[in-house]
């Protein structure tokens, strides 16, 4: 088991600069760390890689509430 | 700006290793979120994808190729690499390293090297 | 593996004409659909992406459309430095697969 304090963060040095496509996204989590130069959300696509966004484009936050709403429904 | 540039020898022996690598400049390699692929393209035709490497070690290889090829990351020296064993004419192309933000499109290119298998 | 066939393979067109070029996948890909240019002894260039986005910088005599199976890329008002060979490049799963080309000439 990784201990996850000791875990590298990964850092976004750079954000894409398209707008992904809601279906293409599975999750998300946010960079909020000192060791970064900046804050970013990290999305996980559907076939598990990773795009760095920008936290204050609008088509990120709409994108994070879209996943948490996912989330939140249950599965019947 | 990110820029890519390839290296490594434009003449391989049948049956031998082929080996490049692609120098990433202006920006770095461990950046969360970029992918680094290598991408073919065979003399007049069209271009194959070979596979991708993320900065944290993780690949993806075209089944195509899987068995001979491995892409390699050095985090200190902001490069990755590619390795083609038991090379054969079929694998004479130009071969171009390329970048993408975790979204699919290739938007960054090295200028491409011509690698010909000959002996 | 996803198969991607384009045609034509090669055409002719005059400047100011409109050029287009289809794709055709071989299961449905959704918008999961990239265009590059590629000018001879050149890499290619991101020009679409999502089936329909113009990339930064891309002029806007380019667009592209599509969904599913059948997708187009048109050039509205050919320029002489438009003279390339155009891929498309699908993406919706691994391994990623491309057109087999199509070759732009100047009438």
């Known amino acids: 088991q990784p201990d996850a304090i000791n875990a590298p963060v990964t850092c976004c040095y750079n954000f894409t600069n398209r707008k992904i496509s809601v279906q293409r996204l599975a999750s998300y989590r946010r960079i909020t760390s000192s060791k970064c130069p900046k804050e970013a959300v990290i999305f996980k696509t559907i076939v598990a890689k990773e795009i760095c966004a920008d936290p204050k484009q609008k088509w990120v936050q709409d994108s994070m509430d879209h996943l948490d709403k996912q989330t939140q429904t249950p599965k019947t | 700006q990110v820029q890519l540039q390839e290296s490594g020898p434009g003449l391989v022996k049948p049956s031998q290793t082929l080996s490049l690598t692609c120098t990433v400049s202006?920006?770095?390699?461990?950046?969360?979120?970029?992918?680094w692929n290598w991408i073919r393209q065979h003399p007049g035709k069209g271009l194959e994808w070979i596979g991708y490497?993320?900065?944290?070690?993780?690949?993806y290889y075209n089944p195509s190729l899987k068995s001979r090829i491995t892409i390699s990351i050095d985090t200190s020296k902001n490069q990755f690499s590619l390795t083609l064993s038991s090379v054969t004419a079929a694998d004479t192309a130009v071969y171009y390293c390329a970048r993408d933000g975790g979204d699919d499109a290739f938007d960054i290119w090295g200028q491409g090297t011509m690698v010909t298998v000959s002996s | 593996d996803i198969q991607m066939t384009q045609s034509p393979s090669s055409l002719s067109a005059s400047v100011g004409d409109r050029v287009t070029i289809t794709c055709q996948a071989s299961q449905d890909i959704s918008n999961y659909l990239n265009w590059y240019q590629q000018k001879p002894g050149k890499a290619p260039k991101l020009l679409i992406y999502d089936a329909s986005n113009l990339e930064t910088g891309v002029p806007s005599r380019f667009s592209g459309s599509g969904s599913g199976t059948d997708f187009t890329f048109t050039i509205n008002s050919l320029q002489p430095e438009d003279i390339a060979t155009y891929y498309c490049?699908?993406?919706?799963?691994?391994?990623?697969?491309f057109g087999q080309g199509t070759k732009l000439e100047i009438k």
């Open positions: 490497i993320y900065y944290s070690g993780n690949t």
């Open positions: 490049q699908e993406y919706n799963n691994l391994p990623y697969s």
């Open positions: 202006g920006g770095s390699i461990s950046s969360g979120g970029n992918y």
